[in-house]
């Protein structure tokens, strides 16, 4: 056969579907690899061919489109399972070709089992809700194209294992689930089960997502530097180790590029000829506010180092702040035998 543009195994599309549910999988060629759509390809005389490699096998084989009740079918650029079976797991390839052109891509499909509480190895999308922000909604994802608009499915929402009904601040509204005022207690996995009829059969679509309640932009503030502060003086003798922590609180801000950094005499530590090390740690609150600590350390501080200006800086999408550490050289304690004795007139 003639050469084929092989896009390899597209691991971006690690498709996971539930066992015994319908699945519609679009050929990724038209979405991500080619600059034309299926209609254009079809009208240009190109044919879309599907085949697959079973899990733990090397042999490519054609997909059987003659199964009872058309369990697997193809419609335009979509491969349909009505429904899936566990042993449908494997790598699927769609190939677009005619006598002069050929292009193909493979993608992994995993058919996943779930338990009665919707627990499964499925990777769950995360939806962030702002805490105490007013009404916010989540929508049952990835159900478009499964049934025509004339069909009115029934939708049941669950939090974890429990059907959502008569919840205080969570209201099912068809494909949407409304949170009147999102609270930390609303964190968890939410499942919508969409039930619809087709050709005398009833199908179920199960979609689970994780809700994470995060800090609200209404409450977001510029970074707050807790340390260094005016109450702590770093008093050291030459030769001692100087350790100055910079601890900064950041409100949760979607996509904010948060940074903490030190300058010494207005320069990056790297631009100064002293042996400085900086270690960073990060912790998060339940609403994904962030606390970053950067500890500046000079192993053996000199009297010159103790005269320098050490400033901790922090920035987020809300603004920038800076705070200087109070560093001074420890005045040596008087030596009694010489200095105090002199005060008493000893010679």
């Amino acid at each position: 056969s003639e050469r084929c543009d092989d896009w390899g195994l597209d691991t971006m599309r690690q498709i996971q579907v539930f066992e015994d549910e319908p699945a519609r999988i679009k050929c990724p060629l038209f979405e991500h690899f080619l600059k034309f759509n299926y209609s254009t390809a079809h009208s240009a005389g190109l044919t879309l061919i599907w085949y697959w490699t079973r899990q733990d096998r090397d042999l490519e084989e054609p997909i059987n489109f003659r199964l009872p009740e058309n369990r697997i079918s193809k419609e335009k650029d979509v491969l349909w399972f009505r429904p899936t079976l566990l042993n449908d797991t494997g790598n699927y390839t769609c190939m677009l070709r005619n006598t002069t052109y050929c292009s193909k891509v493979a993608f992994p499909l995993e058919v996943v089992q779930k338990d009665s509480c919707f627990n499964s190895p499925m990777k769950l999308p995360v939806h962030k809700l702002y805490i105490e922000y007013g009404i916010q909604r989540i929508t049952c994802p990835n159900v478009d194209g499964y049934f025509p608009s004339s069909v009115k499915p029934t939708i049941t929402w669950y939090m974890g294992c429990y059907k959502i009904q008569n919840f205080n601040n969570v209201i099912p509204e068809g494909m949407n689930l409304s949170f009147l005022i999102a609270l930390i207690s609303n964190n968890g996995n939410y499942t919508c089960v969409v039930t619809y009829p087709e050709n005398g059969r009833t199908f179920h679509l199960t979609r689970t997502l994780t809700v994470k309640v995060v800090g609200s932009p209404k409450n977001a503030v510029p970074p707050v530097i807790h340390s260094p502060n005016d109450h702590v003086v770093y008093e050291k003798e030459p030769g001692e180790e100087l350790l100055i922590p910079c601890t900064v609180y950041f409100s949760f801000l979607m996509d904010s590029r948060n940074e903490v950094w030190w300058t010494i005499d207005g320069k990056k530590p790297d631009d100064i000829t002293i042996d400085v090390t900086i270690n960073e740690s990060i912790s998060h609150s339940r609403t994904e506010d962030e606390t970053r600590t950067q500890i500046l350390s000079i192993k053996k501080v000199t009297s010159e180092d103790l005269k320098r200006s050490y400033v901790c800086h922090a920035r987020s999408a809300k603004g920038e702040v800076a705070k200087a550490a109070k560093v001074k050289q420890k005045v040596p304690a008087p030596r009694y035998t010489v200095e105090l004795a002199c005060g008493f007139g000893a010679t």
Partner: antibody, heavy 118, light 108 residues
Framework: EVQLVESGGGLVQPGGSLRLSCAAS????????MSWVRQAPGKGLVWVAE????????YYPDTVTGRFTISRDNAKNTLYLQMNSLRAEDTAVYYC???????????WGQGTTVTVSS | EIVLTQSPGTLSLSPGERATLSCRAS???????LAWYQQKPGQAPRLLIY???KLASGIPDRFSGSGSGTDFTLTISRLEPEDFAVYYC?????????FGQGTKVEIK
Amino acid sequence: EVQLVESGGGLVQPGGSLRLSCAASGFTFSSYAMSWVRQAPGKGLVWVAEISRGGSHTYYPDTVTGRFTISRDNAKNTLYLQMNSLRAEDTAVYYCARSYGNYPFDYWGQGTTVTVSS
Amino acid sequence: EIVLTQSPGTLSLSPGERATLSCRASQSVIGSYLAWYQQKPGQAPRLLIYSASKLASGIPDRFSGSGSGTDFTLTISRLEPEDFAVYYCQQDTRYPITFGQGTKVEIK
């Protein structure tokens, strides 16, 4: 003298993989966040990935999320970019660059060319 | 995503003239987080201005930056022959970090 030297570019088929490296010298590598920025032929600059000083935090634009992985080895003063499921539109010169706090990309490498073509 | 739009696309000027390049953001950028770069053919970009108005190390003072919020400007007071190049603005207030599409300053 600060130096960033990229390597690992080349010709790869669509769907293939490539690993770029960036060797850093002349500065305290572990003090800087590091990024990869690419430039397609005749086009502008596009940020591709960033990694925090310690390597625990990574950031990507949607166009490469799931396909590209940035990593670093502070002991070897080296930055990496693992690129999988490569596409024709990933063809570009790839630069590594360093940043510190409010100082953006103050030093760049000379770039390494990645060509994705069958 | 913060989109940065540079204008004009091309600026045709003579050496000695003043160049004014604009960068407009689709949403507010904290001034400290806007930078300007110069790029010549076959070379890596070079940092000119950071924090909207601070001159990077080793950059001549004929380059200056100004602006805040959504509107930023790079000014070259008197163009030297070596200044003819492409200039990019860049923001890092929010991820993804984004660049403008570039302004080419060419010899008239």
